[in-house]
């Protein structure tokens, strides 16, 4: 089952995807597409990176993080209800049938007419640090438990806890990575 993320109409949606390059600058090609990951490439490609740069993108889709350090999380600008659906992040790792494929489900909610600051729900993913939510009401600190190194098979399970697109912004600093090499 796909990991689910949420955003409101008019917001920017954030879909996390990470890997750790084997060496600085030793990047792995990545593609993002709308639709579940097929056997090769991504369906309906919206963005692609190569070993140096973002070499293909479409409007409203961009990488906000430092993709040269393996943060290939996708930002979708000013989302509409039509942006709902499954997105594929494919990390094209050298070797035989090594690609990492992640299907992320984006749910777009209608915008609230009178948004009021609301407390984030409990965040139960086990990260060994403190996270401070930002950009949506008063800052609040949540204490999180500890977790050993995250491996490839754990990343999807771990991401299950990141169901709110606003809170998912904090994942970038959390240390959740796929290690290549």
């Amino acid at each position: 089952s796909e990991v689910e993320y949420r955003a409101e109409v008019g917001q920017n949606a954030y879909l996390p995807c990470f890997y750790t390059p084997a060496a600085p600058g030793n990047l792995v090609p990545v593609c993002w597409g709308k639709g579940a990951c097929p056997v090769f490439e991504c369906g309906n490609v919206v963005l692609r990176t190569d070993e140096r740069d973002v070499n293909y993108w479409t409007s409203r889709y961009w990488l906000n993080g430092d993709f040269r350090k393996g943060d290939v999380s996708l930002t979708i600008e000013n989302v509409t209800l039509a942006d709902s659906g499954i997105y594929c992040c494919r990390i094209q790792i050298p070797g035989i049938m090594n690609d990492e494929k992640f299907n992320l489900k984006l749910v777009i909610k209608p915008a609230k007419v009178t948004p009021a600051p609301t407390r984030q729900r409990d965040f139960t993913a086990a990260f060994p640090r403190m996270l401070t939510t930002r950009g949506h009401g008063p800052a609040e600190t949540q204490t999180l438990g500890s977790l050993p190194d995250i491996n490839l098979t754990q990343i999807s399970t771990l991401a299950n806890e990141l169901r709110d697109s606003r809170l998912a912004n904090d994942l970038r600093d959390s240390g959740a990575t796929i290690r290549i090499g």
Partner: antibody, heavy 122, light 107 residues
Framework: QVQLQQSGPGLVKPSQTLSLTCTVS??????????WSWIRQHPGRGLEWIGY???????YYNPSLKSRLTISVDTSKNQFSLKLSSVTAADTAVYYC??????????????WGQGTMVTVSS | ETTLTQSPATLSLSPGERATLSCRAS??????LAWYQQKPGQAPRLLIY???NRATGIPARFSGSGSGTDFTLTISSLEPEDFAVYYC?????????FGQGTKVEIK
């Protein structure tokens, strides 16, 4: 426009290794979005996907052939190649190299080599 | 692996007629289904990808539809050059697989 030119022997002895090369012209084998592939067609029958390689070195093999199969890229020569070991008469087929390019919902195409009829016989 | 069953095996039609080819998958392939045309002595040519998108340079008389397990290729008005063998192929499940083909022949 990218073109593919195949080369390699048309006759291979049983138990030997079938080796074919596909040379890419009119573009770089390092182009993102191109999946350099091998497909075969047994005489009078349908098509069978053998496998593909992406310029990053990401490789996918058909499980039915995986134990005998090697697909590799030589970026310096702008070539990719197929090696199939321990061949039998069942490997007799027309072998095609191909490139699939997927960019977005409005842009996809394929390019095929001319095909090489490979007969396995002593 | 995913089995693709094409029907009919042979379709006998005249130029100008409408051709409807069917492809059924043994399990869902989402919309990741392609159609190819092959003429004798030639390599296959991609016509339709992802169920309904025409590949670059393919005439508008070719159209594809369907999702999940049932797909259709329609040639709205057959031209003389359209008589060939047509294959469907899925790229949803590894390995990619092809159907056994439908031959469209002149009646």
């Amino acid at each position: 426009q990218v073109q593919l030119q195949q080369s390699g022997p048309g006759l291979v002895k049983p138990s030997q290794t079938l080796s074919l090369t596909c040379t890419v012209s009119g573009g770089s084998i390092n182009s993102g979005g191109h999946y350099w592939s091998w497909i075969r067609q047994h005489p009078g029958r349908g098509l069978e996907w053998i496998g593909y390689i992406y310029y990053s070195g990401s490789i996918y093999y058909n499980p039915s052939l995986k134990s005998r199969l090697t697909i590799s890229v030589d970026t310096s020569k702008n070539q990719f190649s197929l090696k199939l070991s321990s061949v039998t008469a069942a490997d007799t087929a027309v072998y095609y190299c191909a490139s699939y390019y997927y960019a977005s919902s409005g842009d996809a195409f394929d390019i095929w080599g001319q095909g090489t009829m490979v007969t396995v016989s002593s | 692996e995913t089995t693709l069953t094409q029907s009919p095996a042979t379709l006998s039609l005249s130029p100008g007629e409408r051709a409807t080819l069917s492809c059924r998958a043994s399990q869902s392939v989402s919309s990741y289904l392609a159609w190819y045309q092959q003429k004798p002595g030639q390599a296959p040519r991609l016509l339709i990808y992802d169920a309904s998108n025409r590949a670059t340079g393919i005439p508008a008389r070719f159209s594809g539809s369907g999702s999940g397990t049932d797909f259709t290729l329609t040639i709205s008005s057959l031209e003389p050059e359209d008589f060939a063998v047509y294959y469907c192929q899925q790229r949803s499940n590894w390995p990619p697989t092809f159907g056994q083909g439908t031959k469209v022949e002149i009646k």
